[in-house]
């Protein structure tokens, strides 16, 4: 495939990545699948600078990111290492809270109204952000 050199229509370019901000809500798994179908992934936050960029675009709205611990350890969807990476949890989070009564704890991370992160029930229909890197091989065939 060819290398993607500019962002698709309706995506926002920032620091050699492209971002798409939803205006509707989906469960985390559905949001994850949506991004994958776009040859992208749920946003992976690797720096304070990227955090501020995303925060600016989403506003004070609960929004899924590409971080979950559904299999035990916290994992970023693109394989970025959680342990050594950037973190911006709210105080006392993540708490894997069971008190919601919906079954299970809280296994998916989202931006809260102040931008800091919280873990929540993955089935909640929050907005989401997709990210794809420029210069990575595109799935589309090259133009001849």
């Amino acid at each position: 495939g060819s290398e993607r050199t500019c962002c698709p229509v309706n995506w926002v370019e920032h620091e050699r990545s492209c971002y798409w901000f939803s205006r509707s809500g989906k469960a985390w798994a559905d949001a994850d699948n949506y991004c994958r179908l776009e040859d992208a992934h749920l946003v992976v936050v690797t720096s304070w600078e990227e955090q501020k960029f995303v925060q600016h675009h989403i506003g004070p709205v609960n929004t899924w990111m590409g971080l979950h611990d559904q299999n035990g350890p916290w994992k970023w969807v693109d394989g970025t290492d959680y342990e050594t990476g950037f973190k911006n949890w709210r105080p006392e989070q993540p708490d894997d809270w069971y008190g919601h009564g919906l079954g299970g704890g809280e296994d998916c991370a989202h931006f809260t109204d102040d931008g800091r992160w919280n873990d929540d029930v993955c089935q909640r229909p929050y907005r989401w952000v997709c990210e794809t890197e420029l210069d990575k091989a595109s799935q589309e065939p090259p133009l001849l």
Epitope: G72, Y82, P94, D95, D96
Partner: antibody, heavy 112, light 107 residues
Framework: EVQLVESGGGLVKPGGSLRLSCAAS????????MNWFRQAPGKGLEWVSS????????YYADSVKGRFTISRDNAENSLYLQMNSLRAEDTAVYYC?????WGQGTLVTVSS | DIQMTQSPSSLSASVGDRVTITCRAS??????LAWFQQKPGKAPKSLIS???SLQSGVPSKFSGSGSGTEFTLTISSLQPEDFATYYC?????????FGGGTKVEIK
């Protein structure tokens, strides 16, 4: 590499107390709910207690409620289980565990 | 409390056999189910979480399926190192509960 190392087990008389410790390493301890499980000799697995990363959400099995206290020190990457009013039926190997990873366990024997 | 019923409690099988262990929950638990393997004198080892997600480093001969109240663990081709006791555990709600275990022995 994720590691959980329990300590503090031993022989104690009925009615006595014991404090188990679990030293965690290789992961961001404060990001994880932690549990204590136990296994009596020749028996199956039993959950004992659970504590959220910030200690705000705690649960106990009915069999230990009012006698055992779970706590953690995120600065020290440590999990604790204070066991009071011990009974013979508390005799077991006690395991410290994250959802996906268990320590090797420490044996607690309650006998006169 | 949610009761977890595992069957069989023990089974004898030969190397190369396909083995299936069943776990039934007393109420629906979605896919909040884990499978553990335990060998004598050792700590339980996590094999599968969320009913079907293989833990990192666990060989693909292990697979899990199910949702709601019925779950299965399958070992596609039993190897000598697989002879152990297997437990299911629900983490849908507290108290966390386990099945009684299935001891897989050499025939």
């Amino acid at each position: 590499e994720v590691q959980l190392v329990e300590s503090g087990g031993g022989l104690v008389k009925p009615g006595g107390s014991l404090r188990l410790s679990c030293a965690a390493s290789g992961f961001t301890f404060s990001s994880y709910r932690m549990n204590w499980f136990r296994q009596a000799p020749g028996k199956g697995l039993e959950w004992v207690s659970s504590i959220s990363g910030s200690s705000t959400d705690i649960y106990y099995a009915d069999s230990v409620k009012g006698r055992f206290t779970i706590s953690r020190d995120n600065a020290e990457n440590s999990l604790y289980l204070q066991m009071n009013s011990l009974r013979a039926e508390d005799t077991a190997v006690y395991y410290c565990a994250r959802r996906d990873f268990w320590g090797q366990g420490t044996l607690v024997t309650v006998s006169s | 409390d949610i009761q977890m019923t595992q069957s069989p409690s023990s089974l004898s099988a030969s190397v190369g056999d396909r083995v299936t262990i069943t776990c039934r929950a007393s109420q629906a638990i979605n896919t909040y189910l884990a499978w553990f393997q335990q060998k004598p004198g050792k700590a339980p080892k996590s094999l599968i979480s969320a009913a079907s997600s293989l833990q990192s480093g666990v060989p693909s001969k292990f697979s899990g399926s199910g949702s709601g109240t019925e779950f299965t663990l399958t070992i596609s081709s039993l190897q000598p190192e697989d002879f152990a006791t297997y437990y299911c555990q629900q983490y849908y709600s507290y108290p966390l509960t386990f099945g009684g275990g299935t001891k897989v022995e050499i025939k």
